[in-house]
Amino acid sequence: HSFGPGPGLGTPRSPCNARGPCRLFFRVCLKPGVSQEATESLCALGAALSTSVPVYTEHPGESAAALPLPDGLVRVPFRDAWPGTFSLVIETWREQLGEHAGGPAWNLLARVVGRRRLAAGGPWARDVQRTGTWELHFSYRARCEPPAVGAACARLCRSRSAPSRCGPGLRPCTPFPDECEAPSVCRPGCSPEHGYCEEPDECRCLEGWTGPLCTVPVSTSSCLNSRVPGPASTGCLLPGPGPCDGNPCANGGSCSETSGSFECACPRGFYGLRCEVSGVTCADGPCFNGGLCVGGEDPDSAYVCHCPPGFQGSNCEKRVDRCSLQPCQNGGLCLDLGHALRCRCRAGFAGPRCEHDLDDCAGRACANGGTCVEGGGSRRCSCALGFGGRDCRERADPCASRPCAHGGRCYAHFSGLVCACAPGYMGVRCEFAVRPDGADAVPAAPRGLRQADPQRFLHHHHHHHH
């Protein structure tokens, strides 16, 4: 767990300024998940300040690595039952020490806010938040104080009197095999799932439930869609299995059937298909790591965080391994630089994602009137006369291949080449021997002389007919 400069955010800075040593405190504040209060409102679920704080003596300009958090836990006692959904606010405060501190002794360095869902008794949840240029690593969990147990700390347990069994009429207390459910002190019939009590004959309801025995979901005024009232006003029952069985609506939402599916009527401050989105607004600063909070059209509607490249999650709280999405095509090597993604392309490929195949005719044209020819997974340029090289960019000597047969002399010309044939031969490449008796000229390829490259011959022939 640490609080320190975030990665890629310039020179690490000390939390202290030039006025001498300082120490950091952490204020943890818990607010209800459906809080309609302002950002600066009371921490209705509880608050606590860290203790046993180390003193930092670095000055600006000195490198400051991640700073150790204060020793020991920050314990935030919460009243009533644990709601499960809540807003967690962590503030990092700096206290300036020394005689020459001057100015305000306390400064708020950073403040992170996020909505969270957490059952009591679960493992530590880890988190990393960035705000300004600081990065805070922390873990949190919710724990019930004995004799309370359960995800909401709403059930009471006590140690077994005998190792083997609980008292008459009392069940073992899961998940604690050595404990038993405490004798019922709540109002008889008080829902064990949705109700709890702190005084005898009392029945307090968890968030989202109402009624004298906490059996009626909030916003449910009557039974809908073939549901019938249950015994002793315990809610509504469904004759057979249906889409609302098990109530898919979270956070106290009430479920109603709609043409084979279901619809959730959410309590104020919750949104989404299953009322899973809590009512934290942009004013709470829920978007981390540079995320921008985009609110709904009205102040009560849910927010969306637009995350900078490299982060994701409803609060931009998760760093993305963008290379795991394999964005580089054609075997390119992916490099995630934090602020940008780079692809190092294999030979023959180019483009930001190595998407351009340089060995593909669509990728690049041949220069100087050359023609692109594909074949065997690669491409080559068939160059116009007078040009050569991979892309026909090099000037070629048309006579270099000795194209004139039978001792003909080659002359380079701006449009190609001209062969001056030896006596007794004719043709574009001096390829025809002239018969003295007036018979037709026939192609001749005497031994020891190279016949013209057919491709060159055809190309040249084609050229001359234009």
Partner: antibody, heavy 118, light 108 residues
Amino acid sequence: QVQLQESGPGLVKPSETLSLTCTVSDNSISNYYWSWIRQPPGKGLEWIAYIYYSGTTNYNPSLKSRVTISLDTSKNQFSLQLSSVTAADAAVYYCARVFHWGFAFDIWGQGTMVTVSS
Amino acid sequence: EIVLTQSPGTLSLSPGERATLSCRASQRVSNTYLAWYQQNPGQAPRLLIYGASSRATGIPDRFSGSGSGTDFTLTISRLEPEDFAVYYCQQYGTSPLTFGGGTKVEIK
């Protein structure tokens, strides 16, 4: 370092649509958000919209009904269209790159002046 | 939307003096997501500060930013001739992104 270049007509008639394009000098268009900001003569800056290659867009509510922003990764360009322009839309229009850590603007084009007149 | 009010509108100082510019927000700027820009006549703005207090690449250390919540300050410890310009603050915590009206720092 990457450079941005705005292009488009400097004169638009009232009620017509203003179209501007910003060309990004390198291949980084898929790595950042890209934005348009304007500044009427002698006045302050007003953010118009931004876009990300994934399709994410966001518009200033005061202009949302008239603005469209789009992006073409193959050309390394992004564009702005502002419909039904009036004299109040006359301004220097800047394209800008959104900073990699937060929605500030770290690289700006030099700006293009748009006049609205018949 | 968050309205940013900059003061003073104009600041008349001499080279070598210290300049203190204020930016006040109508609501809390979340996570100190506030930036400062400098704009010279006929030029595009230049990012100076982000995250309320972090200098952008290549910005001299005479520029510093501070503040949180609704009150933010840009300080130029010792004015150089090239620092006489218009300065804008911008919040990027909540959409829409908004700019302050600007403070002009002029030579006295």
